[in-house]
């Protein structure tokens, strides 16, 4: 697994460097998670032909993966910092159950899957410090999450492979949109 942000040799070798600002830390954390997702996608794509599959829509219908929409205030048109921040945190919290699902889906990248899950938790904590209105954030209901996870794990092998691929792709897109929006804040 890659070294978490702030622990690479360059940081150790340059103690005189200015500490990262909160925005820089968030930016670095997202890029670290995106690197982890790339590694997981590589294993998924090597293992199956899901990455070229045109049958994605079939499986996508069963998943309710978080997506950015115009109303979330994260796009350049109609940008709203607080609305967008609430959407990013809410979306990351909703992704957690899907990241839990990924935990048993990898053989050679098991540690990487865990690193993505744990790093996402750290990112959520960074973002919460930035948010003004935590009351606007609805956390996922554990009972609903449990039945979703059971349903996903009961799928046949092909659908589980497709679900893994779709989760990674959607999470990557969500983080990329978040990164663009956070750079405007």
């Amino acid at each position: 697994a890659p070294v978490p942000p702030g622990e690479d040799s360059k940081d150790v070798a340059a103690p005189h460097r200015q500490p990262l600002t909160s925005s820089e830390r968030i930016d670095k954390q997202i890029r670290y998670i995106l690197d982890g997702i790339s590694a997981l996608r590589k294993e998924t794509c090597n293992k199956s032909n899901m990455c070229e599959s045109s049958k994605e829509a079939l499986a996508e219908n069963n998943l309710n993966l978080p997506k950015m929409a115009e109303k979330d205030g994260c796009f350049q048109s109609g940008f709203n910092e607080e609305t967008c921040l609430v959407k990013i945190i809410t979306g990351l919290l909703e992704f957690e159950v899907y990241l839990e699902y990924l935990q048993n889906r990898f053989e050679s990248s098991e540690e990487q899957a865990r690193a993505v899950q744990m790093s996402t938790k750290v990112l959520i904590q960074f973002l919460q410090k930035k948010a003004k209105n935590l009351d606007a954030i609805t956390t996922p209901d554990p009972t609903t999450n449990a039945s979703l996870l059971t349903k996903l794990q009961a799928q046949n092998q092909w659908l589980q492979d497709m679900t893994t691929h779709l989760i990674l792709r959607s999470f990557k897109e969500f983080l990329q949109s978040s990164l663009r929006a956070l750079r405007q804040m």
Epitope: E96, L99, L134, D135, P142, T143
Partner: nanobody, 118 residues
């Protein structure tokens, strides 16, 4: 598995306050979510509120603005502060823990009785 024990229930006048505690023992206490539920006499158990691992709280509409959930990680305890109590808040109050994001509420306390008299 985590053992949960509620305390702090009792009889209180309408408009009064109570603070319930939920103490956890067992393996390391860092659950995904801690929830409070209640079961009024002759009715089904209903959701009161929850606090997730990062400290975000959500409440049922019926208690919003009156009840507050907090936690003390050092003491492995979650609290439910209940203000401006109403007779319809009379119920057995339960706390529950979800150990992981996909586990559902997998540990429950035995409950504590709260009675609000008019």
């Amino acid at each position: 598995q985590v053992q949960l024990v509620e305390s702090g229930g009792g009889l209180v006048q309408a408009g009064g306050s109570l603070r319930l505690s939920c103490a956890a023992s067992g393996r390391t206490f860092s659950p995904y979510t801690m929830g409070w539920f209640r079961q009024p006499p002759g009715k089904v158990r209903e959701f009161v509120g929850r606090i997730n691992w990062s400290g975000i709280r959500n409440y049922a509409d019926s208690v919003k603005g009156r009840f507050t959930i907090s936690r003390d990680n050092n003491n492995n305890t979650v609290y439910l502060q209940m203000n401006r109590l109403k007779p319809e808040d009379t119920a057995v109050y339960y706390c529950a823990a979800a150990s992981r994001s996909g586990s559902g509420y997998d540990s429950w306390g035995q409950g504590t009785q709260v009675t609000v008299s008019s």
